[in-house]
């Protein structure tokens, strides 16, 4: 039998070899598919409910206007030409549907080294036959049950359309000291050959290394954080870790838009500088660490206040990070 693959919903024409190009013709189509109990015989005369599913064209070919899952099976044609020579055609029809692009849902933004983590769930909807999902790390296939990799798979079939939804949940245990930003992707491989795999957009979770951390110290000058108007406050974030982490600053719990720096200098202090300051150290190998908060206050405030008074010489300096 000749193998034929047809996309679900598309038309299909099967040629009846040896049949005269136009009537009168002596030919017969026999079908054994999901729509038939055993063999169903179709003749050029046609008619009846089968015409909407499959009908014989004037040239003897069999025409299926929209192939469905139930049309998978064997199609045979037996034709006799004008000289009485008999020719048989035999087709094995399989149908397919390519799903939408797979997606990774519930993806983790951060993984912890040394312990199992759920990376995400890969979902492919609307395939036929089911096909398979596979995971990749930095472009290379991940093998389940190897090196801390485990995959939980689930296949569901739509009760009406018969199309498949595949789900694959990936769990990994990142090695300590490994790649801090691994790239994971997932691909759908169709069940029928000659169709290329569909790949998700990659995800790049951070890997956090749980290391016993030494505390981040915040030193304030002048000590106590109380300063006269126009004075200068210097905040220094001391982190014992090597290499030096990136230091960012917070005021009243809100990040300050400043370039990273271990020192924050507040010259020409004014009332709007009052508040609670802390620093956040971000290491490449583990998560952010916040210091204690220190309060900056103004002692003996002068007349300076909103629009009733001015700051600094010709303009208060903007905050600098040293």
């Amino acid at each position: 039998a000749q193998n034929i693959t047809a996309r679900i919903g598309e038309p299909l024409v099967l040629k009846c070899k040896g049949a005269p190009k136009k009537p009168p013709q002596r030919l017969e189509w026999k079908l054994n598919t999901g729509r038939t109990e055993a063999w169903k015989v179709l003749s050029p005369q046609g008619g009846g409910p089968w015409d909407s599913v499959a009908r014989v064209l004037p040239n003897g070919s069999l025409f299926l206007p929209a192939v469905g899952i139930q049309d998978e099976g064997i199609f045979r044609c037996q034709a006799m030409n004008r000289n009485g020579k008999e020719t048989k055609s035999n087709y094995r029809v399989r149908v397919y549907q390519i799903p939408g692009k797979p997606e990774i849902v519930d993806s983790a933004s951060e993984l912890t080294a040394g312990v199992p983590n759920k990376v995400g769930t890969c979902v492919s909807e609307g395939s036929y036959p089911a096909g398979t999902l596979s995971w990749h790390l930095d472009g290379k296939p991940l093998v389940p049950n190897e090196k801390g990799v485990s995959v939980k798979e689930q296949t569901r079939r739509h009760p009406e359309t018969g199309l498949f939804t595949l789900q694959s949940e990936l769990m990994v245990t990142p090695a300590r000291g490994g790649d801090p930003r691994p790239t994971f992707s997932c691909s759908f491989s169709p069940g029928l050959p000659r169709h290329r795999a569909l790949r998700t957009a990659p995800i790049q979770p951070r890997v956090w290394e749980p290391v016993p951390l030494e505390e981040v110290q915040l030193v304030v000058e002048p000590e106590g954080g109380a300063v006269a108007p126009g004075g200068t406050v210097t905040l220094t974030c001391e982190v014992p870790a090597q290499p030096s982490p990136q230091i960012h600053w917070m005021k009243d719990g809100v990040p300050l838009p400043l370039p990273p720096s271990p020192v924050l200098i507040l010259p020409e202090i004014g009332p709007q500088d009052q508040g609670t300051y802390s620093c956040v150290a971000t290491h490449s190998s583990h998560g952010p660490q916040e210091s204690r908060a220190v309060s900056i206050s103004i002692i003996e405030p002068g007349e300076e206040g909103p629009t009733a008074g001015s700051v600094g010489g010709s303009g208060l300096g903007t905050l600098a990070l040293a």
């Epitope: 200068t232 600053w249 005021k251 990040p255 300050l256 838009p257 400043l258 370039p259 990273p260 720096s261 271990p262 020192v263 924050l264 200098i265 507040l266 010259p267 709007q272 500088d273 909103p306 629009t307 600094g312 010709s314 303009g315 208060l316 300096g317 903007t318 905050l319 600098a320 990070l321 040293a322």
Partner: antibody
Framework: QVQLQQSGAELVRPGTSLKVSCKAS????????IEWVNQRPGQGLEWIGV????????HYNEKFKGKATLTADKSSSTAYMQLSSLTSDDSAIYFC???????????WGQGTSVTV | DIVMTQSQKFMSTSVGDRVSVTCKAS??????VAWYQQKPGQSPKSLIY???YRYSGVPDRFTGSGSGTDFTLTISNVQSEDLAEYFC?????????FGAGTKLELK
């Protein structure tokens, strides 16, 4: 008094690079940030990025990443902005300005006109 | 990105008038807003920071107000030297953004 003195006007060919300087005086250079802003002919102001001269830390407007590189030399109290792969779209006046945390820009340079 | 909208591109005024230039932020920026004055061929001059604080040397006829998303620069008793373009700017979060400017002209 606080002053930010920028380098002079430049007329350059497309595809070339250019370094604009901003010399600070009258204050402690490392106590403040230096911001860079541009203004295309007849247009408004656009923030390019900021450098902390004390630490060398920088932050850029995404639009200018790869176009502008900010550096600072503490010994000469000078901030620099290098502009690369110049095109006619980069023709503008470039300003440096002093700023600090919790505050905006207070003093501005006189501007450097760049024509590509 | 936070968009700063100055809805009036031009405003007409007379010497001695009181005029208010407005600026609207697309999201809450607290009081992290500054106002700048720019005259043709000159660099911007800093007037107001933290929405309502005047820089030293700025005449007290310039007043800033507002918080959250709505900000106003008011010039009472407009002088001829105040005829210029005024820009608002947010410095609440990166990247910093400016309004498109409002030109103050004589009636």
């Amino acid at each position: 008094q606080v002053q930010l003195q920028q380098s002079g006007a430049e007329l350059v060919r497309p595809g070339t690079s250019l370094k604009v300087s901003c010399k600070a005086s009258g204050y402690a250079f490392t106590n403040y940030l230096i911001e860079w802003v541009n203004q295309r002919p007849g247009q408004g102001l656009e923030w390019i990025g900021v450098i902390n001269p004390g630490s060398g830390g920088t932050h850029y407007n995404e639009k200018f990443k790869g176009k502008a590189t900010l550096t600072a030399d503490k010994s000469s109290s000078t901030a620099y902005m290098q502009l690369s792969s110049l095109t006619s779209d980069d023709s503008a006046i470039y300003f440096c300005a002093r700023s600090r945390a919790v505050r905006a820009m207070d003093y501005w340079g006189q501007g450097t006109s760049v024509t590509v | 990105d936070i968009v700063m909208t100055q809805s009036q591109k031009f405003m007409s005024t007379s010497v001695g008038d009181r005029v208010s230039v407005t600026c609207k932020a697309s999201q809450n920026v607290g009081t992290n807003v500054a106002w700048y004055q720019q005259k043709p061929g000159q660099s911007p001059k800093s007037l107001i920071y933290s929405a309502s604080y005047r820089y030293s040397g700025v005449p007290d006829r310039f007043t800033g107000s507002g918080s959250g998303t709505d900000f106003t620069l008011t010039i009472s008793n407009v002088q001829s030297e105040d005829l210029a373009e005024y820009f608002c700017q947010q410095y609440n979060s990166y990247f910093f953004t400016f309004g498109a400017g409002t030109k103050l002209e004589l009636k």
